[in-house]
């Protein structure tokens, strides 16, 4: 509360995260036309990546291109992207929703369809809707510890969330343990009014702030967390400003002296830390 | 404007960031005496990483440094690093410029020059110009989508710069469409009084700046974001500072059983996103 | 100081960090049942990775689990984790410690001992103590440039760090040069009073605090940084929250058509710069 | 790395029929699209015909109906069946791949006599 003869100071932040889960995957795989069961285990080195501490992100679902190689081929034929001749391919173009850089020509893309010709890496990514329900969709079991250590510099002033005298298996829980900085994912949706499942098909961002309201007058000190949990990114955006989270990243191989790569388009949940409050002293 | 009755609170900030665009990097290649022409493509898992929300990295340069191998070899012959004698290598010292660690002896380099011997990856890295003009300067034609959710908690408050109304296919205009929030990175620069295609080949920082100065009291109600730009690293910076913006990064492998990597220096844009403003509320 | 008449305005700051140094690594390797020296040679591309601006890592001290291949396996026998019938294994069970889901099978580890089979990345990695001493500890010489450029928006102020008149062979030292902004990994340490060599065996995290506390009226301008350290992580941390600062990834490879991986546990000191003060005017 | 030779290249009446091969060796052709060029006296390279990974071709105008680019992944070879041959077809035709880099043959001659 307001103590208008204190001297208020803002805080200092600094986080540390550390998510711990195992999932499993099981989905059907066809090579060389037969189709298999795979069963793929996804830890911590899998799904998250040595991200700065104020945020952390967990895949929970992925649509892959695998074996893509550098050369030309007729891009995909999404909507809008059919050709009937050169005309329609301008050579050196680079459309925004395409994957390559256009060769001008039009070339044959199945039996029935025709694209423009790009330079790229090929076959092109298809445009697949993400796997639905999420690949990861376990990972609502997941738990993040969230180390926080704060400092108000003018005022002398050094703490961090976790007492010694906290207990390593706890788990967050707004009122039987709403000092405990472990969190389980699923929780930390359903405190935000969101439902899990849903948002790891497409992801999205969610927010865990961390306010500190510190009296650092020594007869009524008072300076610990309190946690509060809101989804950042827009669940109604238009289809066109990229709805969710996802990225794309790579994995690079040769293979027969070809470089080649895997493209994964990750979904997951990009978590933000946000920390703010003051310090006031007389 | 400053209104003395309202309560001030600072902004809390979530940031996500979409880039957009492929870049053909064509170069001349020689190889077992015969010169090809190589057509490389970069999009977004190329040339951009996984980066947190409140920046973003754009290469624009490379020089790599192609089957390295830890083994021992003579330094690279930058200047003051050539030698006569094993008296001037110093067993297990490490020249912060060099790239190993010396073994004690001078050794030929090539026919005319001696260095001294290296624990190192090797062959050590060449001291190359960056390349001029910037392999990837057509990322001059980049856009990148910035969304951004802010909250003022004591206000109870919370928006975001995009509205259901914004179209999808805008461009950021100073003065035709400033409200728009996908931007080109060539006009970011142009903004910032700045040449991209310079930028482009030794890197550098640029600050896209968000400010919001919020009044929300229903009888003024207004908050709506102001862009600006700025180039955050010094381009007068001497030479002993690392002007500009690089940093090396490797692919590893195996070839016949032998860990090799490709060592790359990535030259590039480091887009920072400032988000700064208040909201105030009688 | 507080001079109560001057309007008072928050930092804009954006940070760059450029890490140089190179350690050697000697470790008896075995393979095929022959002990051999082994010296690895680590420089930035292989010990620090792209981070953002306001944090950058050093890795120090790591452990490997080589060519691991998802399959079924005997989990690792950790304290708790034998069994001795399937009646102690629960199948779709994912043990927080453990690497894998359980199949509900108790079968034999080794001669001696018999742990729950799990579907994991086999062979699961090992619970071995972080090497001591520290395998990087030779990081204590690294140094690190730190560029600060700041922004008081308000009063259309922009300074940095680095100012022309600097020499770039300087390195930080409280009283003889405290406003070169080059610091030695170990004399960072020295200042927050710790010990390099003891922190990056498990790795911790290091504050360096920048403090501008600017005056920015033309009769009694200043403006300089103030630099300090101090440790971030809880050195006396309980077990159960995980003490010192590490993280995992993995480098994927396909050998004889089969897809690996090297998970690496990397330990090492991650260092965040926290920068505040205000700028003041009439 | 990969090195393409064509043969099958002649001196053929109008009306008659060539089948050009291109051996490639150094990385299997499955992975990239080949191609042939033709370069006639005095004129620009211009390309013929060309097969992607997953099978389809294109062809220029004037050769559609009359000529047939395959693969023989296995061979590790690329054919160009040339049916119904016109003078206009005389050139000299260059096997193409493009993997990262354009990897060219020597070039094989095909005449068209009248």
């Known amino acids: 509360s307001d103590k208008l003869y204190q001297r208020k100071e803002p805080v200092i932040s600094s986080v540390h995260t550390k998510v711990k889960g195992i999932a499993e995957v099981t989905e059907n795989v066809t090579e060389g036309g037969v189709t298999k069961l795979g069963h793929s285990i996804f830890d911590t080195a899998d799904y998250t990546f040595p991200l700065q501490g104020n945020s952390f992100f967990v895949m929970t679902n992925y649509v892959k291109s695998e074996g893509q190689v550098q050369t030309l081929c007729p891009e995909y034929p999404r909507r809008g992207a059919q050709c009937s001749s050169d005309r329609r391919c301008k050579k050196g173009w680079m459309d925004p929703q395409s994957k390559g850089i256009q060769t001008g020509r039009c070339v044959p893309y199945d039996k029935t369809r025709k694209t423009c010709e790009v330079s790229a890496w090929c076959p092109t990514e298809e445009e697949k809707e993400a796997p639905r329900p999420a690949l990861l969709r376990s990972a609502e079991n997941f738990t993040v510890l969230i180390k926080n250590n704060i400092h108000f510099p003018g005022h002398n002033y050094t703490t961090r969330n976790i007492l010694p005298t906290m207990n390593g298996s706890c788990t967050f829980h707004k009122t039987w343990d709403p000092q405990c900085s472990i969190f389980r994912l699923g929780d930390i949706f359903q405190e935000a009014g969101e439902n899990f499942t849903e948002v790891a098909v497409q992801g999205g961002i969610m927010g865990i702030e961390i306010y500190w309201d510190c009296n650092l007058d020594s007869w009524s000190h008072h300076c610990r967390p309190r946690y509060s949990f809101r989804r950042l990114d827009d669940k109604n955006m238009d289809e066109s400003f990229v709805p969710g989270y996802n990225f794309r990243y790579a994995k690079y191989y040769k293979e027969n002296n070809v470089e080649k790569r895997t493209l994964i388009k990750a979904f997951g949940i990009r978590f933000d830390i946000l920390v703010f409050g003051t310090g006031g002293k007389f | 404007s400053d209104k003395l009755y309202q309560r001030k609170e600072p902004v809390i900030s979530s940031v996500h960031t979409k880039v957009k665009g492929i870049a053909e990097v064509t170069e001349n290649v020689t190889e077992g005496g015969v010169t090809k022409l190589g057509h490389s493509i970069f999009d977004t898992a190329d040339y951009t990483f996984p980066l947190q929300g409140n920046s973003f990295f754009v290469m624009t340069n490379y020089v790599k440094s192609e089957g390295q191998v830890q083994t021992l070899c003579p330094e690279y012959p930058r200047r003051g690093a050539q030698c006569s004698s094993d008296r001037r290598c110093k067993k297990g010292w490490m020249d912060p410029q060099s790239k190993g660690i010396q073994t004690g002896r001078c050794v030929p380099y090539d026919k005319t020059r001696k260095t001294c011997e290296v624990s190192a990856w090797c062959p050590t890295e060449e001291e190359k110009e960056a390349p001029r003009p910037a392999l990837l300067r057509s990322a001059e034609n980049f856009t990148v989508l910035i969304k951004n959710n802010i909250h003022f908690p004591g206000h109870n408050y919370t928006t975001r710069n995009i509205l259901p109304t914004m179209n999808g296919s805008c461009t950021f205009h100073k003065t035709w469409d400033p409200q728009c929030s996908i931007f080109r990175l060539g006009d970011i620069f142009q903004e910032a009084g700045e040449n991209f295609t310079e930028v482009a080949v030794q890197g550098g920082i640029m600050g896209i700046e968000i400010y919001w100065d919020c009044n929300l009291d229903s009888w003024s109600h207004h908050c709506r974001p102001r862009y600006s730009f700025r180039r955050l690293d010094d381009k007068n910076m001497d030479e002993s500072f690392v002007p500009g913006y690089n940093f090396r990064y490797a692919k590893y492998y195996k070839e016949n059983n032998v860990e090799k990597r490709t060592l790359i220096k990535a030259f590039g844009i480091r887009f920072d996103i400032l988000v700064f403003g208040t909201g105030g509320k009688f | 100081s507080d001079k109560l008449y001057q309007r008072k305005e928050p930092v804009i700051s954006s940070v760059h960090t450029k890490v140089k140094g190179i350690a050697e690594v000697t470790e008896n390797v075995t393979e095929g049942g022959v002990t051999k020296l082994g010296h690895s040679i680590f420089d930035t591309a292989d010990y620090t990775f792209p981070l953002q601006g306001n944090s950058f890592f050093v890795m120090t001290n790591y452990v490997k689990s080589e060519g691991q291949v998802q399959t079924l396996c005997p989990e690792y026998p950790r304290r708790g984790a034998q069994c001795s019938s399937d009646r102690r294994c629960k199948k779709g069970w994912m043990d927080p410690q453990s690497k894998g889901i359980q199949t509900g099978r108790c079968v034999p580890y080794d001669k001696t001992r018999k742990t729950c089979e799990v579907s994991a990345w086999c062979p699961t990695e090992e619970e071995k103590e972080a090497p001591r001493p520290a395998l990087l500890r030779s990081a204590e010489n690294f140094t690190v440039l730190i560029k600060n450029n700041i922004h008081f928006p308000g009063h259309n102020y922009t300074t940095r760090n680095i100012l022309p008149t600097m020499n770039g062979s300087c390195t930080f030292h409280k009283t003889w040069d405290p406003q070169c902004s080059i610091f030695r990994l170990g004399d960072i340490f020295q200042e927050a009073g710790e010990n390099f060599t003891e922190v990056a065996v498990q790795g911790g995290i290091m504050g360096i605090e920048i403090y501008w506390d600017c005056n920015l009226d033309s009769w009694s301008h200043h403006c300089r940084p103030r630099y300090s350290f101090r440790r971030l992580d809880d050195k006396n941390m309980d077990e159960s929250f995980v003490p010192g600062y590490n993280f995992r990834y993995a480098k994927y490879y396909k050998e004889n058509n089969v897809e690996k991986r090297t998970l690496i546990k990397a330990f090492g000191i991650r260092f965040d710069i926290l920068v505040f003060g205000t700028g003041g005017k009439f | 790395k990969v090195q393409l030779v064509e043969s099958g290249g002649g001196l053929v009446q109008a009306g008659g029929s060539l089948r050009l091969s291109c051996a490639a060796s150094g990385s299997p052709i499955s992975s990239y699209a080949m191609g042939w060029y033709r370069q006639a006296p005095g004129k620009p390279r211009e390309l013929v015909a060309r097969i992607y990974t997953g099978g389809t071709a294109w062809y220029e105008d004037s050769v559609k109906g009359r000529f047939t680019i395959s693969r023989d992944n296995a061979q590790n070879t690329v054919y160009l069946q040339m049916n119904s041959l016109k003078s206009e077809d005389t050139a000299v035709y260059y096997c193409?791949?493009?993997?990262?880099?354009?990897?060219w043959g020597q070039g094989t001659q095909v005449t068209v006599s009248s």
């Open positions: 193409h791949g493009r993997v990262r880099y354009d990897y």
